[in-house]
């Protein structure tokens, strides 16, 4: 039976959520964001072997064609399936405002 | 001025919609699909340089962190932004049925 969550490459090698610690400078935000000063960025990293966390039919097609034509068709890619929102305190022309971004932090991952 | 659709790597090198001609056998569908016998598969292929077709804030973050930590954080990846539906005539235990798939053919692409 196919197991879409068992990584055939070994633990932690396949597409999954990682956390990367980053400063405002790292993110290129220092000139427009005041807070937070540091962000625990959650993002999707890892390989997408056959049948692993396939997002949809398109991912299945892509994998099959990648196996046939690896120089033409890339393997599916590990990307966010959904996001967690985050509030930023950002600089404006007149001071600061609160702005919530819905597409900033990955919540879970799949292969497309 | 930033242009999210101008490829700095040269024409056709960046993330865009490609069409790949595939048979049912190529797709691994020969045992369950009757028609179509061949599919013009539209998929997203190409590089995602900085600021090119960035899907969202997460893609911007990923690119900035990739430049800082290329061994840890991969570049954004070219994936479908939306899909075109497609109908398949598929085999069933008793004969055939029509089934529409909403997530089979890429319609347009972006970098995530």
């Amino acid at each position: 039976a196919r197991n879409g969550d068992r990584c055939p490459l070994g633990p932690g090698r396949c597409c999954r959520l990682h956390t990367v610690h980053a400063s405002l400078e790292d993110l290129g935000w220092a000139d427009w964001v005041l807070s937070p000063r540091e962000v625990q960025v959650t993002m999707c990293i890892g390989a997408c072997p056959s049948q692993f966390r396939e997002a949809n039919m398109h991912a299945q097609i892509k994998m099959n064609l990648h196996r046939l034509k690896p120089d033409t068709v890339p393997a599916p890619c590990c990307v966010p399936a959904s996001y967690n929102p985050m509030v930023l305190i950002q600089k404006t022309d007149t001071g600061v405002s609160l702005q919530t971004y819905d597409d900033l932090l990955a919540k879970d991952c799949h292969c497309v | 001025a930033r242009n999210g659709d101008r490829c700095p790597l040269g024409p056709g090198r960046c993330c865009r919609l490609h069409t790949v001609h595939a048979s049912l056998e190529d797709l691994g569908w020969a045992d369950w699909v009757l028609s179509p016998r061949e599919v013009q598969v539209t998929m997203c292929i190409g590089a995602c340089p900085s600021q090119f077709r960035e899907a969202n804030m997460h893609a911007q973050i990923k690119m900035n962190l990739h430049r800082l930590k290329p061994d840890t954080v991969p570049a954004p990846c070219c994936v479908p932004a939306s899909y075109n539906p497609m109908v398949l005539i598929q085999k069933t235990d008793t004969g055939v049925s029509l089934q529409t798939y909403d997530d089979l053919l890429a319609k347009d692409c972006h970098c995530v």
């Epitope: 005041l34 807070s35 937070p36 967690n84 929102p85 509030v87 305190i89 600061v96 919530t100 932090l105 | -």
Partner: antibody, heavy 118, light 106 residues
Framework: QVQLQESGPGLVKPSETLSLTCTFS??????????VGWIRQPPGKGLEWLAH???????RYNPALKSRLTISKDTSKSQISLKLSSVTAADTAVYYC??????????WGQGTTVTVSS | DIQMTQSPSSLSASVGDRVTITCKAS??????VAWYQQKPGQSPKALIY???YRYSGVPSRFSGSGSGTDFTLTISSLQPEDFATYYC????????FGQGTRLEIK
């Protein structure tokens, strides 16, 4: 827009536990960086921070009151509860809840008056 | 804990005056200071974040400055609606407030 509404018993007897609820709208405690804090103001006096709870369920308490305070959240109901045990007359105050964005009290509720008296 | 000492505790001024309120932290709090305005019978309202940034909607006559231990809130030209009590707040450590400055009409 952001709204916060405090509710409480109004009158509490000494040695009892005070239970307060903050019902909020216009933001979500599932959003990274968001939190809700409780601050009180005794009659004619200044502001005193009591506790806060963050999106990631991290809780912080005023060290001077920590043993008497409990804060909790019900994200699905958009409610925050605060309990203050063993109350005395010194706990008579207006109790405010406030939206926190990171560490800043960006927006405050109207407050609820609590009197401790037998 | 970090003490925030505001001065003066009360102040009389006239419409059009320039007013400065100071706040001194008992230890370095970087720029992690906010200012709030509270009118009688109302809840506090955010004015300034990170020592010097006005919150959206706050009139430009309000300004903040300082870093480390010394902070000021300045109202460049007092308007009738500015007569209120002002509080500083540090959020570098667990939150503490100044004791307040009551601004009255002369």
């Amino acid at each position: 827009q952001v709204q916060l509404q405090e509710s409480g018993p109004g009158l509490v007897k000494p040695s009892e536990t005070l239970s307060l609820t903050c019902t909020f709208s216009g933001f979500s405690l599932s959003t990274s960086g968001m939190g809700v804090g409780w601050i009180r103001q005794p009659p004619g006096k200044g502001l005193e921070w009591l506790a806060h709870i963050r999106w990631d369920d991290v809780k912080r308490y005023n060290p001077a009151l920590k043993s008497r305070l409990t804060i909790s959240k019900d994200t699905s109901k958009s409610q925050i509860s605060l309990k203050l045990s063993s109350v005395t007359a010194a706990d008579t105050a207006v109790y405010y809840c406030a939206q926190m964005a990171w560490d800043w009290f960006a927006y405050w509720g109207q407050g609820t008056t609590v009197t401790v008296s037998s | 804990d970090i003490q925030m000492t505001q001065s003066p505790s009360s102040l009389s001024a006239s419409v059009g005056d320039r007013v400065t309120i100071t706040c001194k932290a008992s230890q370095n709090v970087d720029t992690d200071v906010a200012w709030y305005q509270q009118k009688p019978g109302q809840s506090p309202k955010a004015l300034i974040y990170s020592a010097s940034y006005r919150y959206s909607g706050v009139p430009s006559r309000f300004s903040g400055s300082g870093s480390g231990t010394d902070f000021t809130l300045t109202i460049s030209s007092l308007q009738p609606e500015d007569f209120a009590t002002y509080y500083c707040h540090q959020y570098n450590s667990y939150p503490t407030f100044g004791q307040g400055t009551r601004l009255e009409i002369k």
